[in-house]
C-alpha cells in the first residue's frame, strides 16, 4: 500500500566495522525522502537521518550505547516536499532491517602491527590496540577493552627466504616468538573472535618485515 509516488526501501543491510555502523538500503530516491528509526527489542523507536535523500544512515551513536543489545531499524519513505503524506493505511511506507547485534556481528577491522623488537633469538611483536567509537566514562574504548579475552590475534610469521607461514596466537596484543639467528622474518596479524560463528576473522594486517624501520634489533 502507500501513496502512488513512493516506494518502500528494500535490501536493508548493516555495514559495520569495529562498531562503526551504517545502515544501507535501496533504491536511490526519485521524488521521495527517507527517515530511519532504530530501537532495541524492548526499547522505543528513535528517529535518525530525517527526510534524507541518502540511502545510508550512520547509526553508530545509537548502537555504541550497548553493543551487546540486539537492534532493529526501519526505513520510512515519504513523498519529497510532502512529508506529512501517508499511505492508505494512515502511515508512511516502511521496511524493517534484519536484526543486528554489534558485539556478535561487527566486522573486525584490519589490524596493524605497531612494532616488533628482536632480542637474540626472540622477537616481540606488538599489535596496535585500535580505538573504537564505544565509550565508557567519556573515554573511547579500544577493541581489547570491548572484547576482552574473546578477542585473539593470530600471528603469521615466515622467513623472508621461505613461503611456509608459521602461526602463533595471543589473547593480549603481544607475541613472543622464537626465530633463527641471522634470518630475516616477515609478519602479518589477523584478529579473530573464536566464539563467533560468522565474521570470526579480520582481514590480514599489512605485512611487516625485519630490516624495515618499524622493527628494532638488539644483539644480546
Amino acid at each position: 500500500s502507500g501513496t502512488t509516488n513512493t516506494v518502500a526501501a528494500y535490501n536493508l543491510t548493516w555495514k559495520s566495522t569495529n562498531f562503526k555502523t551504517i545502515l544501507e538500503w535501496e533504491p536511490k530516491p526519485v521524488n521521495q525522502v527517507y527517515t530511519v528509526q532504530i530501537s532495541t527489542k524492548s526499547g522505543d523507536w528513535k528517529s535518525k537521518c530525517f527526510y534524507t535523500t541518502d540511502t545510508e544512515c550512520d547509526l553508530t551513536d545509537e548502537i555504541v550505547k550497548d553493543v551487546k543489545q540486539t537492534y532493529l531499524a526501519r526505513v520510512f519513505s515519504y513523498p519529497a516536499g510532502n512529508v506529512e503524506s501517508t499511505g492508505s493505511a494512515g502511515e508512511p511506507l516502511y521496511e524493517n532491517s534484519p536484526e543486528f547485534t554489534p558485539y556478535l556481528e561487527t566486522n573486525l577491522g584490519q589490524p596493524t602491527i605497531q612494532s616488533f623488537e628482536q632480542v637474540g633469538t626472540k622477537v616481540n611483536v606488538t599489535v596496535e590496540d585500535e580505538r573504537t567509537l564505544v565509550r565508557r566514562n567519556n573515554t573511547f574504548l579500544s577493541l581489547r577493552d570491548v572484547f576482552g579475552k574473546d578477542l585473539i590475534y593470530t600471528l603469521y610469521y615466515w622467513k623472508s627466504s621461505s613461503s611456509g607461514k608459521k602461526t602463533a596466537k595471543t589473547n593480549t596484543n603481544e607475541f613472543l616468538i622464537d626465530v633463527d639467528k641471522g634470518e630475516n622474518y616477515c609478519f602479518s596479524v589477523q584478529a579473530v573472535i573464536p566464539s563467533r560463528t560468522v565474521n570470526r576473522k579480520s582481514t590480514d594486517s599489512p605485512v611487516e618485515c625485519m630490516g624495515q624501520e618499524k622493527g628494532e634489533f638488539r644483539e644480546i
Epitope: I152, K165, K166, V192, V198, D204
Partner: antibody, heavy 120, light 107 residues
Framework: EVQLVESGGGLVQPGGSLRLSCAAS????????IHWVRQAPGKGLEWVGY????????YYADSVKGRFTISADTSKNTAYLQMNSLRAEDTAVYYC?????????????WGQGTLVTVSS | DIQMTQSPSSLSASVGDRVTITCRAS??????VAWYQQKPGKAPKLLIY???FLYSGVPSRFSGSRSGTDFTLTISSLQPEDFATYYC?????????FGQGTKVEIK
C-alpha cells in the same frame, strides 16, 4: 551440523599424483583453518599441513614439503591436498580437520578419512 | 619441532579401572595440549583441550592435567566404550605434533 567429507583417495604408483578433497558443510571454511593429518596403517597420527582459506597461507611438515600442496576454493567450501611425487611411505588414511582457531581449542571436527595407497 | 613423548604405548585394563596416560613435551607448550580418542577405522575425536578442559559431550570420567611440560589424561572408571587408542597433541607452535599413541586394551 558441522561435517567434513574427504574424497579422492585410491591406489597410485610411486612417483604418481593424487588430489584429495575435503568438502565442508555447516560452517564457512574461510572463517576457520583446515589441517590435513595422516595415519599410516597401524601407526600414529602425523600432521601434514594447514591452510587459512581466507588468505591462502599454508605450512607443511618437512616430510611432505615441496611435494604436497594445500589449497582451498571458498566458493565450493572445499579444501584440497595435491600430492605429487608420491612414495610408498605416503600410504595412509588422510584426514582433514577443522581448526577452531582459539588459544585453547584446535582440531575440533575431523572427516572420516580417505585411504591413499602408494604401490607398484 | 616440539616432541611429544607419550607413555605407555599400550596398557591392559578392566572395566572400572582407573587409567592414566602421560605425555611429556620436549619444551614449554603452556597449556596448548589436546587429547584425542580414536577407535579402529574411525577418525580421532577431541576429548580434552587446553590441557584440562573437557570438550562438549565428553563424559566426566575423562580428565586432563598439567604439571610443567608433563600432561596427563585420566579415565576415572574405564567403561567398555573407552577401549581405544589415545593421542596427545601440542598446538603451541607450528608444526603441531602428536604423541605416539596409547592403546587401551581389555585385560
Amino acid at each position: 551440523e558441522v561435517q567434513l567429507v574427504e574424497s579422492g583417495g585410491g591406489l597410485v604408483q610411486p612417483g604418481g599424483s593424487l588430489r584429495l578433497s575435503c568438502a565442508a558443510s555447516g560452517f564457512t571454511i574461510s572463517d576457520y583453518w583446515i589441517h590435513w593429518v595422516r595415519q599410516a596403517p597401524g601407526k600414529g597420527l602425523e600432521w601434514v599441513g594447514y591452510i587459512d582459506p581466507a588468505n591462502g597461507y599454508t605450512y607443511y611438515a618437512d616430510s611432505v614439503k615441496g611435494r604436497f600442496t594445500i589449497s582451498a576454493d571458498t566458493s565450493k567450501n572445499t579444501a584440497y591436498l595435491q600430492m605429487n611425487s608420491l612414495r610408498a611411505e605416503d600410504t595412509a588414511v588422510y584426514y582433514c580437520a577443522r581448526d577452531y582457531g582459539s588459544l585453547h581449542v584446535q582440531l575440533d571436527y575431523w572427516g572420516q578419512g580417505t585411504l591413499v595407497t602408494v604401490s607398484s | 619441532d616440539i616432541q611429544m613423548t607419550q607413555s605407555p604405548s599400550s596398557l591392559s585394563a578392566s572395566v572400572g579401572d582407573r587409567v592414566t596416560i602421560t605425555c611429556r613435551a620436549s619444551q614449554d607448550v603452556n597449556t596448548a595440549v589436546a587429547w584425542y580418542q580414536q577407535k579402529p577405522g574411525k577418525a580421532p575425536k577431541l576429548l580434552i583441550y587446553s590441557a584440562s578442559f573437557l570438550y562438549s559431550g565428553v563424559p566426566s570420567r575423562f580428565s586432563g592435567s598439567r604439571s610443567g611440560t608433563d600432561f596427563t589424561l585420566t579415565i576415572s572408571s574405564l567403561q567398555p566404550e573407552d577401549f581405544a587408542t589415545y593421542y596427545c597433541q601440542q598446538h603451541y607452535t607450528t608444526p603441531p605434533t602428536f604423541g605416539q599413541g596409547t592403546k587401551v586394551e581389555i585385560k
